[in-house]
């Protein structure tokens, strides 16, 4: 177990032309806060995939109001580190996403009070217990300077926080005739991991998960001093070597403390000492909870059903992501039918319909012939979002208003001669041919 720590040094306009002056203005003061998301291995840095190693949300920074005419400074930052506790081994390679959020402090009618200013992501190799690593990342016109490290929570040590260290036995605990004890120093029993909560002073292990007590101590975690009267007692099973009672199952057996918490027995039950970022009777509650306001853009926070998911965000229409931080491209779902043009106005979706269609999603096919008359006995034919006239013989054009020359298309075959007639056309066929169009 251990903690990933992130220290933001500065956030402000990057070098070069086109850099923004400030995300805040004299008219609209604002403050910044940060979110970090960690994933094990060199995985894709997709913002919506789960932060399997953990996530943290900073406090809000001081309020900043831009001074007109003044050079753009680095913006005031929240105090303190962002800390992401991890309960298992530190993976060594990890991916991170750091988001810079702006909270607008004016009354923004029609717009969210939060907006994502910048998102930087990267993949790094990092050994636990090493020095702070410094980094500079640019996102668009913004520049973020930060440091990070992974450190193990005692008694864990090592580059992956998987080795447990305990002090050697003090000289006074050595029995007569036994080899002299080594001076008090850290002794790493790699790769042994004793039972969580096993007393570092009075306990040790030779197998993973066990907790064996030095002489004079008992209990599942070697925290209970043995009084001489309890030895060689007829009650309960006794140890062949000491004659002292072998403890039965205790409240800390199986370690009820989640998320790397260590268990200690109390007179009535047990107590968990939780790593940073977790709390609750069994350290089951994650550092980021509903009380931190983790859901953006008007989302609602719902307490998680299981201890590993401390909260779930219920996002309003138009937003998605584990924190409702992503605006949905609602036009990508192609909601406008019949070739309508989709417009996402933020607060609403609009469809601009082609001629002949109507409705919020262009779903209604209008009666193209309504109010449309075809002249000279033509009949209206509906279709394709526009009306069309089927004209009587001798007439043409969109509305059958133009007198047509029925002979223009040379309808008489085999050299027949065409004559226009009030009822249409007449073909005078060449010798040897017959039919309305001299086709026979």
């Amino acid at each position: 177990a251990g903690v990933f720590e992130l220290q933001i040094h500065s956030f402000g306009p990057g070098p070069g032309p086109g850099a923004p002056r400030s995300p805040c203005s004299a008219r609209l003061p604002c403050r910044l806060f940060f979110r970090v998301c960690l994933k094990p291995g060199l995985s894709e840095e997709a913002a919506e995939s789960p932060c399997a190693l953990g996530a943290a949300l900073s406090a809000r920074g001081p309020v900043y109001t831009e001074q007109p005419g003044a050079p753009a400074p680095d913006l005031p930052l929240p105090d303190g580190l962002l800390q992401v506790p991890f309960r298992d081994a530190w993976p060594g390679t990890f991916s991170f996403i750091i988001e810079t959020w702006r909270e607008e402090l004016g009354d923004q009618i029609g717009g969210p009070a939060w907006s994502l200013l910048a998102r930087v992501a990267g993949r790094r190799r990092l050994a636990a217990g090493g020095p702070w690593a410094r980094d500079i990342q640019r996102a668009g016109a913004w520049e973020l300077r930060f440091s990070y490290r992974a450190r193990c929570e005692p008694p864990a040590v090592g580059t992956a926080c998987t080795r447990l260290c305990r002090p050697r036995s003090a000289p006074s605990r050595c029995g007569p005739g036994l080899r002299p004890c080594a001076p008090l120093e850290d002794e790493c029993e790699a790769p042994l991991v004793c039972r969580a909560g096993c007393s570092p002073e009075h306990g040790f292990c030779e197998q993973p998960g066990e907790c064996r007590c030095l002489e004079g101590w008992t209990g599942p975690l070697c925290t209970v001093p043995v009084s001489t009267s309890s030895c060689l007692s007829p009650r309960g099973p006794s140890s062949a070597t000491t004659g002292c009672l072998v403890p039965g199952p205790g409240p800390c057996d199986g370690n009820p403390c989640a998320n790397g918490g260590s268990c200690s027995e109390t007179p009535r039950s047990f107590e968990c000492t939780c790593p940073r970022g977790f709390y609750g009777l069994r350290c089951e509650v994650s550092g980021v909870t509903c009380a931190d306001g983790p859901c953006f853009n008007g989302g609602l926070c719902v307490g998680g059903a299981d201890p590993d998911s401390a909260y779930i965000c219920h996002c309003p229409p138009g937003f998605q992501g584990s924190n409702c931080e992503k605006r949905v491209d609602r036009c990508s779902l192609q909601p406008c039918r019949n070739g309508g043009l989709c417009l996402d106005l933020g607060h609403a979706l609009r469809c601009r319909c082609r001629a002949g269609f109507a409705g919020p999603r262009c779903e209604h096919d209008l009666d193209d012939c309504a109010g449309r008359a075809c002249a000279n006995g033509g009949t209206c034919v509906e279709g394709g979002g526009a009306h069309r006239c089927s004209c009587a013989l001798g007439f043409g054009g969109r509305d059958c208003r133009e007198r047509a020359d029925p002979c223009a298309a040379r309808p008489c075959a085999h050299g027949g001669r065409c004559y226009a007639h009030f009822s249409g056309l007449v073909c005078a066929c060449a010798p040897g041919y017959m039919g309305a169009r001299c086709e026979f």
Partner: nanobody, 130 residues
Framework: QVRLVESGGGSVQAGGSLRLSCETS????????MAWFRQAPGKEREGVAS????????YYADSVKGRFTISQDNAKNTVYLQMDSLKPEDTAMYYC???????????????????????WGQGTQVTVSS
């Protein structure tokens, strides 16, 4: 489905009292900032009071401080707005709203603005006559 149900509105003489209720589900109640807004005809919707049921101090707009009290009943997943010493200018449609907020931000004027909230009740009318 998100459910916010207001009740308790009505007509009252100036100087009188009313108590509005806003009931929601237990999944939403306690995990979110609960706020009361009001909207008078022809005016913007304004924040009146807010509370984070899981803890923290309540917030009141200056116009209602000392006259309105926001409270909660955890067993009923309900937030109340006790309105005393009512004035004609308190006449408005009153709405209950909820959203994810930190406990601290729930108690700020900048937090309790219309644009910060996406989930609303249907509203209850309060009319104060002189």
């Amino acid at each position: 489905q998100v459910r916010l149900v207001e009740s308790g509105g009505g007509s009252v003489q100036a100087g009188g009292s009313l108590r509005l209720s806003c009931e929601t589900s237990r999944y939403i109640y306690g995990n979110n900032c609960m706020a009361w807004f009001r909207q008078a005809p022809g005016k913007e919707r304004e924040g009146v009071a807010s509370i984070y049921p899981a803890g923290g101090r309540p917030y009141y707009a200056d116009s209602v401080k000392g006259r309105f009290t926001i409270s909660q009943d955890n067993a009923k997943n309900t937030v109340y707005l006790q309105m005393d010493s009512l004035k004609p200018e308190d006449t408005a449609m009153y709405y209950c709203a909820a959203r994810s907020f930190s406990i601290a931000d729930c108690a700020t004027q900048s937090g309790i603005t219309r644009s910060n909230f996406a989930y609303w009740g249907q509203g209850t009318q309060v009319t104060v006559s002189s």
